[in-house]
């Protein structure tokens, strides 16, 4: 699977009047990465995994870029003629990818009221559009506007291609993305607690993405929540994550307890060492 960065921007109009603000979502390798809400764009990291690894500069830069792109998309929607009454949406999806062989892909796609009407390969500048006459009319309208705008602003689409790839490479370098899935290493340890009791700790480390289930089971049945202690899922500095779960058990009953781990569709059980 290639590494990918995907920007999804949506602007709205009501009775032919373009609404202020916009909605933006960014996905990194298919995972929600950051988001801007409608009225005030402030790029927000989606989840601890993004916030921990990337600093404020990232969010400032993405906020600035997304705000600019949102403004451009509102101008494009305002340019679409023959807008009927009611609510309408214009959506721009921009995707760039880096494949295993280091070849790259970049494209942008425009949707009006959820229907694709125009695409462009940002690397080669090739435009494509669906065969329907409505889509083609819309496509010519928007394409001509974008072409005029590009001539005025002297910005071309290969710049978008380069910018998207630059951001993706920056995120890859930062360690926020490693690979699609890295399975955890699971290690179970024991330590004396009080007379007749021991604490068993199950540690999972080196996994990606950060979503994981880790719990203790007795005779195959999960222990209640209040009898277990969980550590936070934390970055380990290598672009992967670590966490732990512990519980207290009676000495001599170790063989009845197992640590259950589930990650990215795979699961395993791990006994307490004797």
């Amino acid at each position: 699977e290639p590494h990918s960065l995907r920007y999804n921007l949506t602007v709205l109009s009501w009775d032919g009047s373009v609404q202020s603000g916009f909605l933006a979502e960014v996905h990194l390798d298919g995972q929600p990465f950051l988001r801007c809400d409608r009225q005030k764009c402030r790029a927000k990291p989606q989840g601890q995994w993004a916030e921990d690894v990337l600093g404020n500069k990232t969010w400032d830069r993405e906020t600035r870029d997304l705000t600019g792109n949102g403004k451009d998309l509102r101008m494009t929607l305002a340019h679409i003629k023959d807008q009927k009454e009611g609510l309408h949406s214009l959506q721009e999806i921009r995707v760039c990818e880096i494949h295993e062989d280091n070849s790259t892909r970049s494209s942008q796609h425009f949707y009006y009221d959820g229907e694709l009407f125009l695409s462009q390969n940002l690397e080669t500048e090739e435009w494509t559009m669906p065969q329907s006459s409505r889509a083609q009319t819309l496509a010519m309208n928007v394409r001509n506007f974008l072409k005029e705008d590009a001539m005025k602003t002297k910005t071309h689409y290969h710049a978008m291609h380069a910018d998207c790839l630059q951001e993706l490479r920056r995120y890859l370098k930062s360690g926020v993305v490693l690979r699609r899935t890295v399975p955890p290493m699971v290690n179970v340890t024991r330590s004396e607690a009080s007379e007749g009791n021991i604490t068993v700790t199950c540690r999972a480390s080196g996994f990606y993405p950060w979503n994981i289930t880790l719990s203790w089971r007795q005779d195959g049945v999960s222990l209640s929540h209040d009898t277990q202690q969980w550590g936070d899922v934390l970055p380990d500095g290598n672009g992967t994550y670590q966490t732990w779960v512990a519980t207290r058990i009676c000495q001599g009953e170790e063989q009845r307890f197992t640590c259950y781990m589930e990650h990215s569709g795979n699961h395993s059980t791990h006994p307490v060492p004797s």
Epitope: R105, T124, E125, E126, H156, Y157
Partner: antibody, heavy 115, light 108 residues
């Protein structure tokens, strides 16, 4: 009817610069599409050299990039190829072609590199 | 760069037979950026099929194309003597644009 026609010298000396021009009729090179140069050495396959797009952007094959320049003259509706420091390996039929799926081609011009 | 490998290198069939030409890419290609060309001896190539499965203008219906991802196929349902040519696949997904090495189609 869209037509493309290559022109330029058929013989170039080693180490010199190969210069070819493609004249386009029936379509404006600033309206749309990429305007490509493609070559074919004798008895071999096709190799894409590069293009100038409708917007003026140029893209080159990395294997030739250091030696290639593609430019356009919009007033004459022409685009040109310059390939510097040529060797015998650059002997080929040179084609100009329109698009990304190359829908119109010139008839090709044979360029021989020889002293 | 994306390398395209065509097979077989040469195909020799009788008139009326079905010809199947394959093109395999080293990396995934969007089907809208994949094309086939026919080149007859002494002529410039001509676009045969564009965007994987669309017949170019003036191309007879016995030619068809299919495929996605890394594997694409050109099929000639019933060979005619005038189909003798070299057939090239080409990708326009990413720079540099690349061609396959060609499949030479001969008539027995």
């Amino acid at each position: 009817q869209v037509q493309l026609q290559e022109s330029g010298p058929g013989l170039v000396k080693p180490s010199e610069t190969l210069s070819l021009t493609c004249t386009v009729s029936g379509y404006s090179i600033t309206s749309d599409y990429a305007w490509n140069w493609i070559r074919q050495p004798p008895g071999k396959g096709l190799e894409w050299i590069g293009f100038v797009s409708y917007s003026g952007t140029t893209k080159y094959n990395p294997s030739l990039k250091s030696r290639v320049t593609i430019s356009r003259d919009t007033s004459k509706n022409q685009f040109s190829l310059k390939l510097s420091s040529v060797t015998a390996a650059d002997t080929a039929v040179y084609y100009c072609a329109r698009g990304y799926g190359f829908d119109y081609w010139g008839q090709g011009t044979t360029v021989t590199v020889s002293s | 760069e994306i390398v395209l490998t065509q097979s077989p290198a040469t195909l020799s069939l009788s008139p009326g037979e079905r010809a199947t030409l394959s093109c395999s890419a080293t990396s995934s290609i969007s089907s809208i950026y994949f094309h086939w060309y026919q080149q007859k001896p002494g002529q410039a190539p001509r676009l045969l099929i564009y965007r994987t499965s669309n017949l170019a203008s003036g191309i007879p219906a016995r030619f068809s194309g299919s495929g996605s991802g890394t594997d694409y196929t050109l099929t000639i349902s019933s060979l005619e003597p005038e189909d003798v040519a070299v057939y090239y696949c080409q990708q326009g997904t990413t720079i540099p644009f690349t061609f396959g090495q060609g499949t030479k189609l001969e008539i027995k």
